[in-house]
């Protein structure tokens, strides 16, 4: 059965997925799809990487971590109830039937009113935002520093990401990592 993850409407959802590259920069293709993993590849692909870079993504879906170190966890921006469901993370390790596949269940809850933190600088420093556009990439991505027009929802979302990043580290420490090579 799938591991379950939760997020609130309007926030960013975080779906963890990791592997350990055999050597730095020795990446393997990864795909993320909406729906359970099929027999090969991913269905309804929302993002994919190749041996070098993120080479396909759709709006609202991005990799927040350092995918070059094997952190291919998916962030879904500004989620709605329609984002609920199963997501597939498939790590396409070369060889004969070597793929590692993970089905993750995302449950979206209605939004709660959360008090907004007063200082945005700390959040943007900890979590620089990646701007991407829909398309076949790899388009140039820009890392933004302080955003003057950042809203309260984004700030509380970043606060949640800070909290969730500890969960990601716990996950990594608990051995939920695929080691290659």
């Amino acid at each position: 059965s799938e591991v379950e993850y939760r997020a609130e409407v309007g926030q960013n959802a975080y779906l963890p997925c990791f592997y350990t590259p055999a050597a730095p920069g020795n990446l393997v293709p990864v795909c993320w799809g909406k729906g359970a993993c099929p027999v090969f590849e991913c269905g309804n692909v929302v993002l994919r990487t190749d041996e070098r870079d993120v080479n396909y993504w759709t709006s609202r879906y991005w990799l927040n971590g350092d995918f070059r170190k094997g952190d291919v966890s998916l962030t879904i921006e500004n989620v709605t109830l329609a984002d609920s469901g199963i997501y597939c993370c498939r790590i396409q390790i070369p060889g004969i039937m070597n793929d590692e596949k993970f089905n993750l269940k995302l449950v979206i809850k209605p939004a709660k009113v959360t008090p907004a933190p007063t200082r945005q600088r700390d959040f943007t420093a900890a979590f620089p935002r990646m701007l991407t556009t829909r398309g076949h990439g790899p388009a140039e991505t820009q890392t933004l520093g302080s955003l003057p027009d950042i809203n309260l929802t984004q700030i509380s979302t970043l606060a949640n990401e800070l909290r969730d990043s500890r969960l990601a580290n716990d996950l990594r420490d608990s051995g939920a990592t695929i080691r290659i090579g």
């Epitope: 293709p29 799809g33 729906g35 359970a36 099929p38 027999v39 090969f40 590849e41 991913c42 269905g43 309804n44 692909v45 994919r48 396909y56 396409q92 390790i93 070369p94 060889g95 004969i96 039937m97 070597n98 793929d99």
Partner: antibody
């Protein structure tokens, strides 16, 4: 238009080997997964092997896993199936097929005309 | 491996009829089911993927439905060129498996 042309079939004795080829044209070969599917004399379809677009990942059912090897040459737009330790139950029409995957995995959206393999003493 | 039980094996029909072929998966396969048409002496031709999405160029009279374990291919207003064998396939888990086929014949 998309074309897939298999070749290399024939009559072979049990325990023998055979290499099938599939020449692809009309599409960017290196942008697709590719598969081999066979159809037995009683018309049943059986999946035989699949290979990723780069050739780095391969997939087989248990029935052929240690005997068949799928490979590809993207420079030559050609798919291969090396078959060894052939058995009478491998007798079938062998089809190569194209598998789109980039935005959504879809199995076998184009098939070749097939090449017949008969395993008999 | 997942068994795809396809029924019926044979079906007699007349031009203009509406017919349905069913496939039952032995395990949950989500909507990862495809349907293929094969005419005598030809290779299979794809009709449907993701249980209900028609391939480009497939006439609207071919409709796929279902999810989980039960799937149906419906041909409304059967035409003479539809007389063929139809196969379902699941591509949810390895090995990818096919149904045994349904032969559509004229009454």
């Amino acid at each position: 238009q998309v074309q897939l042309q298999e070749s290399g079939g024939g009559l072979v004795k049990p325990g023998g080997s055979l290499k099938l080829s599939c020449a692809a044209s009309g599409f960017t070969f290196s942008s697709y997964y590719m598969s081999w599917v066979r159809q037995t004399p009683d018309k049943r379809l059986e999946w035989v092997a699949t290979i990723s677009n780069s050739g780095g990942s391969t997939y087989y059912p248990d029935s052929v896993k240690d005997r068949f090897t799928i490979s590809r040459d993207n420079a030559k737009n050609t798919l291969y199936l090396q078959m060894s330790s052939l058995k009478s139950e491998d007798t079938a029409m062998y089809y190569c097929a194209r598998d789109p995957y980039y935005t959504n995995y879809v199995p076998m959206d184009y098939w070749g005309q097939g090449t017949m393999v008969t395993v008999s003493s | 491996s997942i068994v795809m039980t396809q029924t019926p094996k044979f079906m007699s029909t007349s031009v203009g009829d509406r017919v349905s072929v069913t496939c039952k998966a032995s395990q949950y396969v989500d909507t990862y089911v495809a349907w293929y048409q094969q005419k005598p002496g030809q290779s299979p031709k794809p009709l449907i993927y993701s249980a209900s999405t028609r391939h480009t160029g497939v006439p609207a009279r071919f409709t796929g439905s279902g999810s989980g374990t039960d799937f149906t291919l419906t041909i409304s207003n059967v035409q003479s060129e539809d007389l063929a064998e139809y196969f379902c396939a699941q591509y949810s888990s390895s090995p990818l498996t096919f149904g045994a086929g349904t032969k559509l014949e004229l009454k």
